[in-house]
Amino acid sequence: LRLLDHRALVCSQPGLNCTVKNSTCLDDSWIHPRNLTPSSPKDLQIQLHFAHTQQGDLFPVAHIEWTLQTDASILYLEGAELSVLQLNTNERLCVRFEFLSKLRHHHRRWRFTFSHFVVDPDQEYEVTVHHLPKPIPDGDPNHQSKNFLVPDCEHARMKVTTPCMSSGSLWDPNITVETLEAHQLRVSFTLWNESTHYQILLTSFPHMENHSCFEHMHHIPAPRPEEFHQRSNVTLTLRNLKGCCRHQVQIQPFFSSCLNDCLRHSATVSCPEMPDTPEPIPDYMPLW
């Protein structure tokens, strides 16, 4: 988790002088509770936005937006702590909005936004906005939390972000798989414009089961430059097992930008359709 390396971060708006500061995620008001604390944020919304760094790289960011409740507690609102928690790693990053002037009621509801938390493709987050100071122990909570799921690199807008392109999102192998005679599969795919090796992982399954009945790995050496964007054809021999008829072919590239962690593409061959009742073979061929 990190912040976008983006100009000075601002949170000021007409009628409010405000500065954005790094935070340890442990505001001083936890240690020194105050008697009067503000109410919780209202209508917290998290959206996927995209932003460029100063170097021109494009990253997915969490766009956080919330409003204030229209009660007198805004007189005691000194700022807000914004926290993004990556749910599986438990990694947390926080920033603090520090209000340098007192808030006053005005004709519009106060609205705040922040769009500088960089998020990773295909990851899950919890976003929390805490109004400051935080409540006394056993006081009413004055925060709001929402979960946020970032789409993977298959998503159209994500595909062109720097992290996705680094993992090979622009490569479309256009995999085709055909069943040949003598228990063989022909796999064909388009090579990318990089001299790197590939691996074909074949996993076969019985018709209606998810436990594999055959696994095979095939190594494809790095292509020469004149082979870039060309089709690579590989014939794989299957194990002659009755009913082991559903095949999943996965192609793993080893691009220099992502090494062992590149996006994999797969294609599946279903078992041949079995007729419900076998049709009888006639003894003679009718002429009509």
């Epitope: 998290i46 749910l87 599986n88 438990n90 799921l149 998503h155």
Partner: antibody
Framework: QVQLVQSGAEVKKPGASVKVSCKAS????????ISWVRQAPGQGLEWMGW????????NYAKQFKGRVTMTTDTSTSTAYMELRSLRSDDTAVYYC?????????WGQGTLVTVSS | EIVMTQSPATLSVSPGERATLSCRAS??????LGWFQQKPGQAPRPLIY???TRATGVPARFSGSGSGTDFTLTISSLQSEDFAVYYC?????????FGGGTKVEIK
């Protein structure tokens, strides 16, 4: 091929505990959390909570807090869900699922029957 | 917690017809919604999530729409294998919740 394989059916007496296992394969175990969902006979799906396979951090549904413990063993890519002080209304199929929010792969389910 | 309400409880449709299933959240969940299909004796199967994205291997006849509090799962032309129970699930709130399910049965 991502797979979650759960332990077999269990029959327990009221007041006892049950521990269901969920062995993951086909992906990097610590990349995604594991969620647990249960389904009583003829009923809908009920979320129980999740565990971070990376940090061990947990988030339990309110109605299970104090009775449930979710753990993982990263060396065997296995997640566990232990439910204590079993009651007859805990009779259900217990599912593990990959991830915390988008439950994209599910185990086959483990039937836990609580009966005296 | 966010309460998810599905309607109707049962939907009778003929094969080849269009099926429209509804899911309503008790508060705004933006697009943080998933749909699952479950057949008797099987685990739920993910269909659609978030940005109306179909899960791996889900046919194009399944589509999701809606945001905020009202969501719809549409099956454009029902096939025999589509008769099942369908659940929606919100993941906006830290405590996930499922709808009660809609059973799609043969008319």
């Amino acid at each position: 091929q991502v797979q979650l394989v759960q332990s077999g059916a269990e029959v327990k007496k009221p007041g006892a505990s049950v521990k269901v296992s969920c062995k993951a394969s086909g992906y990097s175990f610590t990349r995604y959390g594991i969620s647990w969902v249960r389904q009583a006979p003829g009923q809908g799906l009920e979320w129980m909570g999740w565990i971070s396979t990376y940090s061990g951090n947990t988030n339990y549904a309110k109605q299970f807090k104090g009775r449930v413990t979710m753990t993982t063993d990263t060396s065997t890519s296995t997640a566990y869900m232990e439910l204590r002080s079993l009651r007859s209304d805990d009779t259900a199929v217990y599912y593990c699922a990959r991830r915390v929010l988008r439950l994209d792969y599910w185990g086959q389910g483990t039937l836990v029957t609580v009966s005296s | 917690e966010i309460v998810m309400t599905q309607s109707p409880a049962t939907l009778s449709v003929s094969p080849g017809e269009r099926a429209t299933l509804s899911c309503r959240a008790s508060q705004d969940i933006s697009i943080s919604l998933g749909w699952f299909q479950q057949k008797p004796g099987q685990a739920p199967r993910p269909l659609i999530y978030g940005w109306n994205t179909r899960a791996t291997g889900v046919p194009a006849r399944f589509s999701g729409s809606g945001s905020g509090t009202d969501f719809t799962l549409t099956i454009s032309s029902l096939q025999s294998e589509d008769f099942a129970v369908y659940y929606c699930q919100q993941y906006s709130d830290p405590f996930l919740t499922f709808g009660g399910g809609t059973k799609v049965e043969i008319k």
